[in-house]
């Protein structure tokens, strides 16, 4: 008799998930000398232990603590770049500006980037058919809880000037329901973080509007300044030129506004 399996609304675990995590771990620790001490098998065991045999709607931050401990990593606290709804450009930026870091430039973020995973209550199986959707099924699912946990820790570690890249093409440039808006903003430590600098990335080539005047940006400004952190906002009118100028700051065209 085939065993009944819960059907969730979201896509199932990424195929070859265990192999992918293990391979990414090995690659990361080879590239980053400061993480060479990490035992990738132990990392996978801790990752697996966070969700295997557990109901995928009852995952807690505590479930991920063994993994967090193994993945403990020190990044320069004043070189942190947060992002919201503009991951690709943020990653392109840190690939050029090598002294700045997104969450996905850390071991734990790198391991899980773009992956989905979940298990089933009381079985050691990974569910490759479906996993809970954050909206339609439940928020305390393995993927959402993981990102909430690592995002909180990443924000808590930040100091001095923290940068955030925001997508100026979205109807809500700052979205209170995004990971940045719901987790990271509220976990910046005023005792350590002096300023949050938002980079609003323009989409259209002819878009010369000052998106720092957007109501959602003013909402972010209000939240941040109430937390006793200064707020700075800059328009990035030409993201292509912006990246080019990060690569070649001496270029004569890079003195004008980008």
């Amino acid at each position: 008799v085939p065993r009944w399996r819960q059907q969730w609304s979201g896509p199932g675990t990424t195929k070859r998930f265990p192999e992918t995590v293990l391979a990414r771990c090995v690659k990361y620790t080879e590239i980053h000398p400061e993480m060479r001490h990490v035992d990738c098998q132990s990392v996978w065991d801790a990752f697996k232990g966070a969700f295997i045999s557990k109901h995928p709607c009852n995952i807690t931050e505590e479930d991920y603590q063994p993994l967090m401990k193994l993945g403990t990593q020190t990044v320069p606290c004043n070189k942190i770049l947060l992002w919201s709804r503009i991951k690709d450009l943020a990653h392109q930026f840190t690939q050029v500006q090598r002294d700045m870091f997104t969450l996905e430039d850390t071991l734990l973020g790198y391991l899980a980037d773009d992956l989905t995973w979940c298990g089933e209550f009381n079985t050691s199986k990974i569910n490759y058919q479906s996993c809970p959707d954050w909206r339609k099924d439940c928020s305390n699912n393995p993927v959402s809880v993981f990102w909430k946990t690592v995002s909180r820790r990443f924000a808590e570690a930040a100091c001095d000037v923290v940068h955030v890249m925001l997508n100026g093409s979205r109807s809500k440039i700052f979205d209170k329901n995004s990971t940045f808006g719901s987790v990271e903003v509220h976990n910046l430590q005023p005792e350590k973080v002096q300023t949050l600098e938002a980079w609003v990335i323009h989409g259209g080539r002819e878009d010369s509007r000052d998106l720092c005047q957007d109501p959602t940006i003013k909402e972010l400004e209000s939240i941040i300044s109430k937390r006793n952190i200064q707020f700075s906002c800059k328009n990035i009118y030409r993201p292509d030129k912006f990246l080019q100028c990060v690569k070649n700051p001496e270029d004569s065209s890079c003195t004008s506004e980008i």
Partner: antibody, heavy 119, light 107 residues
């Protein structure tokens, strides 16, 4: 380039209201907060208050009951009103721009205007 | 409110000398400290923010240090144009408050 210029009467009678205007150029009042700071002759600096880019204000509690800061974005002007003045309010009054959008310290200052409270 | 205390009130020095100015807060201000320079008849000029960050166009002979409640402005080799009054300001909490100033005068 960024400039701030204070203007207003140099002499105010006791119990009257001191009114000053700060006219800015080189940036928009919708992008930065403007602070008022004063300095009695031969003394140190005292922060009076700020009007943020969105129009909200914060005041020094020691002056809060007497001070009002407002602005007109289209005219690039910020005004300071201080009521019921006494000789202790005699000072050079400065307006200054916050360093960042919501900045708590000041990178550009006006040249200051001396206001004397005397009958 | 946070009280900022600067010492000494006056320093009499010669060009070329090393200068150390002190600023103490009545409580922890978590590195939210700036230094200004003011010359007679002029508005203050921002030198350093966040304890150590030198403003653009400020000469490298100026430097800042400190943490918690105790902060220092150092001028490595005093130049004739450096004789002025120096103020510290905390921006940890409102009302933002200034020290009473240290006057650096020619000996």
């Amino acid at each position: 380039q960024v400039q701030l210029q204070e203007s207003g009467p140099g002499l105010v009678k006791p119990s009257e209201t001191l009114s000053l205007t700060c006219t800015v150029s080189g940036f928009s009042l919708t992008s930065y907060g403007i602070h008022w700071i004063r300095q009695p002759p031969g003394k140190g600096l005292e922060w009076i208050g700020v009007i943020w880019r969105g129009g909200s204000t914060d005041y020094n509690p020691s002056l809060k009951s007497r001070v009002t800061i407002s602005k007109d974005n289209s005219k690039s002007q910020v005004s300071l009103k201080l009521s019921s003045v006494t000789a202790a309010d005699t000072a050079v009054y400065y307006c200054a721009k916050g360093k960042v959008t919501t900045g708590f310290y000041f990178d550009f200052w006006g040249q200051g205007t001396l206001v004397t409270v005397s009958s | 409110e946070i009280v900022m205390t600067q010492s000494p009130p006056t320093l009499s020095l010669s060009p070329g000398e090393r200068v150390t100015l002190s600023c103490r807060a009545s409580e922890d201000i978590y590195n939210r400290l700036v230094w200004y320079q003011q010359k007679p008849g002029q508005a203050p000029r921002l030198l350093i923010s966040g304890v150590t960050s030198l403003e653009t166009s400020i000469p490298a002979r100026f430097s800042g240090s400190g943490s918690g409640t105790d902060y220092t402005l150092t001028i490595s080799s005093l130049q004739p144009e450096d004789f002025a009054v120096y103020y510290c300001q905390q921006y940890w909490s409102t009302p933002y408050t200034f020290g009473q100033g240290t006057k650096v005068e020619i000996k």
